[in-house]
Each structure stands twice: as structure tokens, then as C-alpha cells.
Interface confidence: low
């Protein structure tokens, strides 16, 4: 009897949908695996007789529930199928956006770049999929614990009237208000402000 794949899970980030599993202990030899998806009531092969422990399902429709399954195989024997259900638009993890930060005197000018989607047009981003897409920004004075959060209305934001000659750190994430779903924070970007440009009267 061939044991089934273990720890079967979907690792989906920005609609790059990778079904992953682990090979069970099997004394007779090396196992291969077949992974399938349900399409119009018929299971279709996606990865056949692979020695890998993952299979890329990024070409699935972003909408609706998908049933995926994987089994282990050895010679003419095979394990039971292990099934999972997956809805990309609900379940994919929103990866961190890109961010460009520029210091101008006592202000930080930020531009945000929504994560790109795998297997789509070059310009296609998560904003194209989620109508309610917005950004959360948090910033703080370097070395302090107090963080301030803002929700920009656009793909850019300016933090004004900051303390001069002070290092501020900024990070951004995607947020879907209608789903109350937050993405992963970007790595903090820390920049030092320069002088206050206000002229004393």
C-alpha cells in the first residue's frame, strides 16, 4: 500500500498558486506524484508522475472554489487522493507592495506600487483584481515603539512637518476594506529628514 502525500497545502501569494506536499516514508523506493484539478466535473492532470513535491496551479481562474488533489505513486500502485479546496481570490496572500521614498527637507514623499500578478500582462497588478484595493502605511521615528498609521487615498502620500534631522521608517501593505483582508507589510524603509525649510519671520 502506497502512503499518501503528507502536509498538503496551498501556498498562494499574489495568485502564484503552488500546491505543496511532503513525500511520505516509503521503504520500497522513490515515489512519484500526480496532482490534478477539477474542471467541469472531470479531474485534469496538472503535474504527472513528478518527483517534485509541488505543482504550480497559477493558471487557475482567480474566482470560484477549486478542488485540487494529489496522490503518491510507485510502479503500478498508488495512494489515495488527498484533496484540498482553494479559492484564489479569497485565499491568496497579498504580498508586500513596492515603495519609493524620497526626502524633501522635513517631509517624506512616498509612491506605492501594487504587487504584480503572476501569469498576467506585465502591467497587471493586484489593484486590477480587487476593486476596493487601498494601502495602509505605518511610520515611526527610528528607535521608538510608537507607530502611526494612515490610509492614503492615492498611490502616493506625503508626510509633512516631520522633525528635521530625524530618521523615520515607513512600511506599506495592501488592504481590502470590503473583505477586511490585509496583505503583508513591506520591509521598512528608513530615511533621515534634513532641515526645516520654513523661513523665520
Amino acid at each position: 500500500m502506497v502512503p499518501p502525500p503528507e502536509n498538503v497545502r496551498m501556498n498562494s501569494v499574489n495568485f502564484k498558486n503552488i500546491l505543496q506536499w511532503e513525500s511520505p516514508a516509503f521503504a520500497k523506493g522513490n515515489l512519484t506524484f500526480t496532482a490534478q484539478y477539477l474542471s467541469y466535473r472531470i479531474f485534469q492532470d496538472k503535474c504527472m508522475n513528478t518527483t517534485l513535491t509541488e505543482c504550480d496551479f497559477s493558471s487557475l481562474s482567480k474566482y470560484g472554489d477549486h478542488t485540487l488533489r494529489v496522490r503518491a505513486e510507485f510502479a503500478d500502485e498508488h495512494s489515495d487522493w488527498v484533496n484540498i479546496t482553494f479559492c484564489p481570490v479569497d485565499d491568496t496572500i497579498i504580498g508586500p507592495p513596492g515603495m519609493q521614498v524620497e526626502v524633501l527637507a522635513d517631509s517624506l514623499h512616498m509612491r506605492f506600487l501594487a504587487p504584480k500578478i503572476e501569469n498576467e500582462y506585465e502591467t497587471w497588478t493586484m489593484k486590477n483584481v480587487y476593486n476596493s484595493w487601498t494601502y495602509n502605511v505605518q511610520y515611526w521615528k527610528n528607535g521608538t515603539d510608537e507607530k502611526f498609521q494612515i490610509t492614503p487615498q492615492y498611490d502616493f502620500e506625503v508626510l509633512r512637518n516631520l522633525e528635521p534631522w530625524t530618521t523615520y521608517c515607513v512600511q506599506v501593505r495592501g488592504f481590502l476594506p470590503d473583505r477586511n483582508k490585509a496583505g503583508e507589510w513591506s520591509e521598512p524603509v528608513c530615511e533621515q529628514t534634513t532641515h526645516d525649510e520654513t523661513v523665520p519671520s
Epitope: 502512503p3 499518501p4 502525500p5 503528507e6 502536509n7 498538503v8 497545502r9 496551498m10 501556498n11 498562494s12 506536499w21 511532503e22 511520505p24 516514508a25 488527498v82 484533496n83 484540498i84 479546496t85 482553494f86 479559492c87 485565499d91 491568496t92 496572500i93 483582508k181 503583508e184
Partner: nanobody
Framework: QVQLVESGGGLVQSGGSLRLSCVAS????????IGWFRQAPGKEREGVAC??????????NYIDSVRGRFTISRDNAKNTVYLQMNKLKPDDTAIYYC??????????????WGQGTQVTVSS
């Protein structure tokens, strides 16, 4: 549709113990992942522990702040996953949620969520 029902939360003093249970109904594979997330007041939901079944034993994953204090286990025959929480601290106060497909603990994205059970640790 998978449904998850948590229980076992409550009020406990610092240093005490609680055991949370989550019963899964509907289709869940014993070889897929299931585990616990938590959300403290005013904070992000975070992964706590996740487990999958394995012919070589269990494969468990914990966040650093609970490692050595919390133990996750599952009983596939009862479709139940447990979280044994020892040496509880006030920082552990949160609503604890059960979730499937939880392996990426750093991002609280999961297939199915329970309604949650409140854990309060008093000092």
C-alpha cells in the same frame, strides 16, 4: 463546506494553563494543515501554531513567542485539533481562532476560520 468550532477559552491567571479544542466538520483531509491564530485587542491577527499529520509523526510549526509553552496536537478520528497552553502570560490574551491551510503562520490567510474563543490571562 468546512466548519470549525472552537472551545476551551476562559479567564486564567498568569502562569496557568488552558486547553483549546477545535472540532472540524465537513471535508477536511487528515493530511492537510490545521491550526491556531490569535488576535489581541488593537493588534493584527497572527499565527500561533499549525499541524499536519504524518506517517513519521506530526509536523508542527510554532511562532517563537509560544514555542516551548504551547503544544498543538490533533486527533484525526475525532476531527479535532487541540492547543495546550502552559505558562500563560498576559501577552497571550486574545481571541484564538482555528483555521485550515495555515502553514504560512506569518500571514493570517487560511481557507476556513472558526468564530474564535476568548482567552484572558490576568496578572
Amino acid at each position: 463546506q468546512v466548519q470549525l468550532v472552537e472551545s476551551g477559552g476562559g479567564l486564567v491567571q498568569s502562569g496557568g494553563s488552558l486547553r483549546l479544542s477545535c472540532v472540524a466538520s465537513g471535508f477536511t483531509s487528515p493530511y492537510s494543515t490545521i491550526g491556531w491564530f490569535r488576535q489581541a485587542p488593537g493588534k493584527e491577527r497572527e499565527g500561533v501554531a499549525c499541524i499536519s499529520s504524518s506517517g513519521r509523526g506530526v509536523n508542527a510549526n510554532y511562532i517563537d513567542s509560544v514555542r516551548g509553552r504551547f503544544t498543538i496536537s490533533r486527533d484525526n478520528a475525532k476531527n479535532t485539533v487541540y492547543l495546550q497552553m502552559n505558562k500563560l502570560k498576559p501577552d497571550d490574551t486574545a481571541i484564538y481562532y482555528c483555521a485550515t491551510n495555515c502553514w504560512r503562520l506569518t500571514s493570517p490567510a487560511a481557507d476556513n476560520w472558526g468564530q474564535g474563543t476568548q482567552v484572558t490571562v490576568s496578572s
